[in-house]
């Protein structure tokens, strides 16, 4: 198979320049270099590098490479601070929060939005070829820390938080930025950097639009953008489908699969080092699987490890993402198709509403036929290499409930069994929140890390079981996480990208980079819980809530 290049800018993707600089380890974080801007045009940069490279007998020292980088690249910052016009330091949702300490916490989180607000500098629009950043029209909220650009799935929880904070225009602008990316690349890439071009992230665009519509009833926005929402579905249907045979029948489902040449530019050193001693074919396959795992948003986890015996033991080089049909991706897609159907109904397009409704139903049926494990009363990722369920706890297992991708009659019959499976999994027992897995692998999407979007998914999934016990548990899980974030905020004056299931308030670790502060989706999820359960949540067990 002819693999496409990782992106269309050799300096940032596939070139000797990139290889030499990243392998010299000029920076602790490989992402630092690919986020620099070129001081000259691409042609000059590449030509001059080859001259420099030959001048130093094709073996420049680290110091010489650093001199070259300092002359040809700079970090003038492609973004500038931006003040969203719709920001308010006293949004209406705060009045719903009964507990004084949590109301202060909510106010504190709301006040982080302007600190994370950015817009692309004019220079990036004028010389787009000299930047890895993709210039986008509207101001936006960055996740924080090393993540100084838009990320696809992060945006869902950021937008949810913005809408709770009353920042409808900012939320709309962020959706429009994603649509710009969709038009530019034919799909929404992992993030707004050229080097993310050939991989996407969980397809949450339609859910974002649904959330935006729920708050604004902006029918004109739906009318103007419905074609793009269809286009996003088409990308996944065209490029990520697999046919799974179960019981002699074929079922169409999606996988993460991002084939392109070479290592991830932003983790070049790490990927290249991991393939040391590999054959060319094994190296190519590893790079495809690691990019596919990055596309999942879960970078990285035992969830994508697939050993010869079908287990999830092993290390990063045992990643085989292409053979795994993920529960959450397919639940998201079923939801996305249903949203498009609902939007067409609102726009009075009955034929298209029926067509997309049928697609959503097909997907729900296929999830049930392939991913549901009746013995365990749970959905599991499916290993298509060995035709087996991956019977391990992951926080993503219950995602079909979150996306309303479960037949209501089936749910009624199985509600108690599903709730029992969730409680007995052990995933909801920790004082710091819901961990992504129960396996301590050292990877950042494994135990003991608690990732805010997964807590959001889990809480909604449990609540959608619909029984009184489930609704109580959902609130308890939200309470645990809010308290953990609150304690962390009090202690460190920061919101973190991820938390520690075993120690409330403590940031998570592991993976390829240090903990990041900010943090977009963490803020969004806490605001979601404060908004939803504000009248019941407390900062601690003393229930010392002086009602205001």
């Amino acid at each position: 198979m002819d693999l496409p290049l990782t992106c269309t800018k050799p300096v940032y993707c596939n070139s000797n320049l990139l290889h030499q600089i990243q392998m010299a380890r000029l920076y602790n974080d490989s992402k630092t270099f690919v986020d620099l801007q070129m001081n000259f045009d691409e042609n000059k940069t590449l030509t001059d590098f080859e001259t420099f490279f030959n001048l130093h007998n094709k073996n420049p020292t680290k110091e010489q490479l650093m001199e070259f980088v300092n002359e040809y690249f700079s970090n003038d910052n492609e973004l500038e601070p931006w003040q969203p016009k719709d920001f308010s330091d006293n949004p209406a949702f705060l009045a719903k929060i009964k507990d004084d300490a949590l109301r202060e916490f909510g106010k504190g989180i709301n006040n982080i939005w302007p600190l994370l607000a950015r817009k692309v500098k004019a220079e990036v629009f004028q010389k787009p070829d000299q930047f890895s950043l993709v210039p986008l029209t509207h101001g936006f909220i960055i996740p924080g820390g090393r993540f100084k650009e838009i990320y696809y799935w992060d945006t869902f929880w950021i937008i949810e938080g913005l809408l709770i904070s009353g920042m409808q225009e900012t939320a709309k602008g962020m959706i429009e930025n994603l649509i710009e990316l969709l038009n530019l690349f034919g799909h929404i890439p992992n993030g707004s950097r050229g080097y993310y071009q050939q991989r996407s992230q969980p397809p949450m665009l339609n859910a974002m639009v649904a959330t935006y519509y729920m708050y604004t009833k902006d029918l004109e926005f739906l009318r103007n953008n419905i074609a793009y929402l269809e286009k996003e579905l088409d990308f996944w249907m065209d490029n990520r489908v697999v046919s799974v045979n179960r019981g002699g029948k074929n079922y169409t489902l999606l996988r993460y699969y991002a084939p392109s040449k070479g290592p991830r530019p932003e983790s070049y050193y790490e990927d290249y080092s991991n393939t040391e001693g590999f054959s060319e074919e094994d190296s190519t396959n590893f790079c495809i699987d690691i990019k596919s795992a990055a596309e999942s948003g879960w970078d990285f986890s035992t969830r994508w490890f697939l050993m010869p015996d079908g287990s999830n033991n092993g290390t990063l080089t045992d990643l085989h993402t292409r053979y795994i049909i993920p529960v959450d991706l397919n639940a998201i897609f079923a939801g996305a198709a249903q949203y498009v159907s609902n939007f067409h109904a609102l726009l009075k397009n009955p034929q298209k509403a029926a067509r997309y409704g049928q697609l959503a139903q097909t997907w729900r049926d296929n999830i049930q036929a392939v991913l549901w494990n009746d013995q365990d009363a749970m959905w599991y990722d499916f290993n298509i290499r060995d035709n087996l369920h991956r019977r391990y706890y992951y926080s993503s297992n219950a995602a079909p409930l979150w996306q309303n991708a479960v037949n209501p009659d089936f749910l009624k019959l199985n509600a108690d069994r599903i709730l029992k499976a969730i409680t007995e999994s052990g995933g909801v027992d920790f004082p710091g929140g819901v961990p992504t897995s129960l396996i301590r692998s050292g990877e950042q999407w494994d135990f003991p890390n608690v990732w805010p979007p997964e807590v959001s998914i889990e809480v909604a999934a449990i609540e959608n079981i619909g029984t009184p016990e489930a609704i109580t548990l959902a609130q308890e899980v939200a309470q645990t996480f809010v308290r953990s974030c609150h304690w962390g905020f009090q202690k460190y004056k920061q919101m973190f990208e991820k938390y520690d299931a075993e120690t409330p308030g403590r940031f998570g670790g592991g993976g390829e980079y240090n903990v990041q502060f900010g943090f977009g989706w963490s803020n969004g999820v806490v605001l979601e819980f404060l908004n939803k359960y504000g009248s019941q949540l407390t900062a601690d067990d003393s229930n010392n809530t002086n009602n205001s």
Epitope: M1, M237, V241, S243, T252, L359, T362
Partner: nanobody
Framework: QVQLQESGGGLVQPGGSLRLSCAAS????????MGWFRQAPGKEREFVAA????????YYADSVKGRFTISRDNAKNTMYLQMNSLKPEDTAVYSC????????????????????WGQGTQVTVSS
């Protein structure tokens, strides 16, 4: 295994019309991109037309544009190829194909993109 069965082929005079059908054995048909290919005697199999799962997007080989129309009825698990203004050079075995899973990037005119094939139906254009 997805079974595909073509029908509607036959002998027709130049300038005449034919409508080919391709029936699929499974309801998952509605999620597949489907294509028509043809192979003339002594020649390579070539792309004719393709249609996305939703029927909104269609693709044609330059040689048939404006004369052939691809369509599908997902309720009936069937795809069609309406062939008008037929020419002697359209003589070939026409096969339908289903793209049930993607192996790379989306090239609806590439043989390698299709995973299931029908047996084919003969179309002969001759006076």
């Amino acid at each position: 295994q997805v079974q595909l069965q073509e029908s509607g082929g036959g002998l027709v005079q130049p300038g005449g019309s034919l409508r080919l059908s391709c029936a699929a054995s499974e309801r998952t048909f509605r999620t597949y991109t489907m294509g028509w290919f043809r192979q003339a005697p002594g020649k390579e199999r070539e792309f004719v037309a393709a249609i996305r799962w939703n029927g909104d997007s269609t693709y044609y080989a330059d040689s048939v544009k404006g004369r052939f129309t691809i369509s599908r009825d997902n309720a009936k698990n069937t795809m069609y190829l309406q062939m008008n203004s037929l020419k002697p050079e359209d003589t070939a075995v026409y096969s339908c194909a289903a793209r049930a899973y993607s192996i790379g990037y989306y090239y609806p005119n590439a043989l390698s993109e299709y995973n299931y094939w029908g047996q084919g139906t003969q179309v002969t254009v001759s006076s």
